[in-house]
Amino acid sequence: EPCVEVVPNITYQCMELNFYKIPDNLPFSTKNLDLSFNPLRHLGSYSFFSFPELQVLDLSRCEIQTIEDGAYQSLSHLSTLILTGNPIQSLALGAFSGLSSLQKLVAVETNLASLENFPIGHLKTLKELNVAHNLIQSFKLPEYFSNLTNLEHLDLSSNKIQSIYCTDLRVLHQMPLLNLSLDLSLNPMNFIQPGAFKEIRLHKLTLRNNFDSLNVMKTCIQGLAGLEVHRLVLGEFRNEGNLEKFDKSALEGLCNLTIEEFRLAYLDYYLDDIIDLFNCLTNVSSFSLVSVTIERVKDFSYNFGWQHLELVNCKFGQFPTLKLKSLKRLTFTSNKGGNAFSEVDLPSLEFLDLSRNGLSFKGCCSQSDFGTTSLKYLDLSFNGVITMSSNFLGLEQLEHLDFQHSNLKQMSEFSVFLSLRNLIYLDISHTHTRVAFNGIFNGLSSLEVLKMAGNSFQENFLPDIFTELRNLTFLDLSQCQLEQLSPTAFNSLSSLQVLNMSHNNFFSLDTFPYKCLNSLQVLDYSLNHIMTSKKQELQHFPSSLAFLNLTQNDFACTCEHQSFLQWIKDQRQLLVEVERMECATPSDKQGMPVLSLNITCQMNK
Amino acid sequence: QKQYWVCNSSDASISYTYCDKMQYPISINVNPCIELKRSKGLLHIFYIPRRDLKQLYFNLYITVNTMNLPKRKEVICRGSDDDYSFCRALKGETVNTTISFSFKGIKFSKGKYKCVVEAISGSPEEMLFCLEFVILHQPNSN
């Protein structure tokens, strides 16, 4: 069975084809080759000499036991080599020779017992080394690591490392890898020698499910003293053994580290006193809790010095009391409990993401809700009922506003967005908004993107509601049940580049409403019920138009519409997916491609 | 279509068939077997995925006695610092994991419950596997 040609001459997918040897019938120019799940078993010298241009080579689960010297010789352009799941028993010293451009080496679950005799010291270009799920017992980074000056990611998770000694990291003292991210999760650690990490700088350190008791966790974290880390991730996994006990003593040792960003990811334990618990983390710039349960929600009003707070997928008794002077970014998403939003006091806040919480807002939105006048980004998408009772007074700095898939009330009772002259992006898609007031978008003089799909209009008619949106470049009006539009609805949108009118209910096509859209490049009218043109003679669309989508409509392919069908053929160079433009009537032409029709009409009057 | 038996409990019998062409082997054990009236136990899965599990989610299509429920999407792996350790599993890496579950207080009517589980992962998104579970429910007190 032949390989699948994904991109001609470039990418070939040969997965699970029962190959015992490397195929020789693929082009020399192949750059991406997936040979995974084939019983190759043995890689001899110059195994891939037929593919000198290879950049990505996937050999996952190929039952490879032996890799000889120079197996990859000639692959000087290879940047990614994947060896996951091969039971390697014999790895020659020169197994990886010739890989002068290799940036990513994945040797997950390959029976690797030690880094010491892993022959990769010459791979100077290596950026990512993943040796997770192996049998490595020692964390000693071999001397050859001093050659790997570009290394940015080292994944040692799911190995057998129990202890870390001062000598293990000596090579990092000689040659500090300032950008190194290190993942040691799922190693059964019980000892970190104090001073082992002294004066070590890491970009990121991840330690999840490493400790089988609170005491071990406590002493190991104390053993990290002196480490300077940009981002520290601690925590557990839901499907692994979890700590039976967790209290403030666990994290006391963090006072002896220099941490820029901290994240606690999953803890099967109720956090009650977060002030004491995170006492050593009051001055990190970014603080993040993922998948934890928080009992006392008042604690977030303590004077933490955080600039970014992230609470994701957590459980709360009620919406937390948030009073944080220095906070600039708050991400509070996919949380449970506390369904009603309560006011927060965050005077420095610029970015607020409150999406996917099922929250309801009794009154939205003004400065008093968020305790700030600096807000530039506000995401309230995928929530519950949001009642618009104020038009963003004090929030005039807003540039990005997202309400999609929340239930907006009172949207047509006043000019909700009147204050937002700096707003660039607005998404009110699928918000149950019924447009019954022409001033709905008044004030949005800087708006560039407006998404309002899945809403409705009074009498299914689009009126002149966009008159002030002179900078608009993207407008989505899909799924709005529209049947008619004002001929002047788009007259002020001279900058508009993309207009989506798909999935509405137009019976006819008219070019007239688009005559002023001098910048229009994409017009999507797919999934309507267009049968013919509104007027017998259709004018041209703006000359800027590059893509016109008329697929999945109800074209009436009869003589009386000959001029419209001819006009469609004349637009052929603009049309996308022409094979999905089919006749709906009459019954003998149903399903025929419109462009293949040859309608010759006898005008017998 | 070959049917794979999972387990029997006092009020349910659970089996599955593949609903994709590939039928890559997957081993599923539930201990103790699920009782629909109330259940607590461990789900053990052994599987070698044909693509990375990053951003794994399930589409669930549930049928209750021929009545179709709306499609549900259950996100398992968001993509970074996920709850489950198998979210970091790579294509070709052995996934051998035990997940605890519990639910209570749901009353099910007697009959045949079908659940099509479409597992989708990776970027670009592609189907990982598709299993159709059949649960025959015989409530012993209803």
Partner: nanobody
Framework: EVQLVESGGGLVQAGGSLRLSCVAS????????MGWFRQAPGKERDIVAR????????YYSESVKGRFTISRDNAKNTVYLQMNSLRPEDTAVYYC????????????WGQGTQVTVSS
């Protein structure tokens, strides 16, 4: 399941009028397009008229423009076709059609009602 039942057909002299009715049952169709097709002996079935949910948009085939009027009463789940100035070439079986609530065109069909125009 949606059922469409037409009525009002019959024999009429050229120049006369008829009013066809179509009642939908099984679910409300107030949010979908409805219309009328016809099929004359030996000819293909083709659309005559169509009306949008709010009645804002209507479509008529060229041959009936100015003579036929489509209308609907959403409260009664009914669509009508008023046919004036009938001609012998209007003789056909007239079918009521409705789109699906999901937006698929011409999803539901009635059994048809015979209209015969004699000269």
């Amino acid at each position: 399941e949606v059922q469409l039942v037409e009525s009002g057909g019959g024999l009429v002299q050229a120049g006369g009028s008829l009013r066809l009715s179509c009642v939908a049952s099984g679910r409300t169709l107030s949010t979908v397009n409805m219309g009328w097709f016809r099929q004359a002996p030996g000819k293909e079935r083709d659309i005559v008229a169509r009306i949008s949910p709010s009645s804002v948009s209507t479509y008529y085939s060229e041959s009936v423009k100015g003579r036929f009027t489509i209308s609907r009463d959403n409260a009664k789940n009914t669509v009508y076709l008023q046919m004036n100035s009938l001609r012998p070439e209007d003789t056909a079986v007239y079918y009521c059609v409705a789109d699906s609530p999901g937006g698929r065109s011409y999803e539901y069909w009635g059994q048809g009602t015979q209209v015969t125009v004699s000269s």
